[in-house]
Amino acid sequence: CKAMHVAQPAVVLASSRGIASFVCEYASPGKATEVRVTVLRQADSQVTEVCAATYMMGNELTFLDDSICTGTSSGNQVNLTIQGLRAMDTGLYICKVELMYPPPYYLGIGNGTQIYVIDPEPCPDSDF
């Protein structure tokens, strides 16, 4: 296992619709053809996996159908979007990148993006 640098923004404020996007950039030492990207959430010293996707270079990222994440890749950058966020989802979102193929295997973990989320104000009741 070899180490690899991963960069991501320090802080992002989600939109009022609970959507946050950020770029995860990795310094690829070689020509990887298969890359795995995992988003981890750290809150109160606990780390949980938010979503993960494996993709072939030049192809789209494919997350599971029920995933809250979507993403696109371009070169050594992955543009990640997390949706359906609520205030309780505020936390540090860490980008983990693994170069799976060809060998050698590389692993990089970013410092994390602090995502702040605010619940939208409830709409006042209105009669139609």
Epitope: P9, A10, V11, V12, L13, A14, T90, L92
Partner: antibody
């Protein structure tokens, strides 16, 4: 080194608007947020809100909603805070500060805004 | 919003004494999001402690922070002349971020 430099003091009449600038240097501007804090004479610190320089999203304190607008110009690494319909109780020192998640770690020198007829 | 309260409002001590400042949140705050600031007259605030207990760059070891949940403490083990100032706690766990009203540490 990481630095935030604010625009100079302003004197405004009630009902007018003021726009304070905050120029960042020494770090990747879009990786962080810029918060705005004010301090009335002899009073404590009041959080006004902040802007995510990464995407331009903003969050304002409830009491200032509708009167304040925070923006950034990423090409010049500058943040702006505009406060409209000024009142005498808006007289304060206005600070910008870098938001990083886990405290605001770098502060501007402050801009004195005086509202007087 | 989370309301932060600080006590005492004023603390009168002599150089060399230990100062204990308290900060309480109206609801539980993750310790990762609790900070302390020092402000001297005519100056901008300065970050002292973040994550409830981690000293910011260049902050002397006499400053320490502790606590969790709703109760947090800033301790200055032995007051130096330059430590007489106003101290604020702040949470950035929930939006909007909020400050406490401050504790003034003055010379007895």
């Amino acid at each position: 080194q990481v630095q935030l430099v604010q625009s100079g003091a302003e004197v405004k009449k009630p009902g007018a608007s003021v726009k304070v600038s905050c120029k960042a240097s020494g770090y990747t501007f879009t990786s962080y947020g810029i918060g705005w804090v004010r301090q009335a004479p002899g009073q404590g610190l009041e959080w006004m809100g902040w802007i995510s320089a990464y995407n331009g999203n903003t969050n304002y304190a409830q009491k200032l909603q509708g009167r304040v607008t925070m923006t950034t110009d990423t090409s010049t690494s500058t943040a702006y805070m505009e406060l409209r319909s000024l009142r005498s109780d808006d007289t304060a020192v206005y600070y910008c500060a870098r938001v990083r998640g886990g405290g605001v770690d770098v502060w501007g020198q402050g801009t004195t805004v005086t509202v007087s007829s | 919003e989370i309301v932060m309260t600080q006590s005492p409002a004023t603390l009168s001590l002599s150089p060399g004494e230990r100062a204990t400042l308290s900060c309480r949140a109206s609801q539980s705050v993750s310790s990762s999001y609790l900070s302390w600031y020092q402000q001297k007259p005519g100056q901008a605030p300065r970050l002292l402690i973040y994550g409830a207990s981690t000293r910011a760059t260049g902050i002397p070891a006499r400053f320490s922070g502790s606590g969790s949940g709703t109760d947090f403490t800033l301790t200055i083990s032995s007051l130096q002349p330059e430590d007489f100032a106003v101290y604020y706690c702040q949470q950035d766990y929930n939006l909007p971020f909020t400050f406490g009203p401050g504790t003034k540490v003055d010379i007895k």
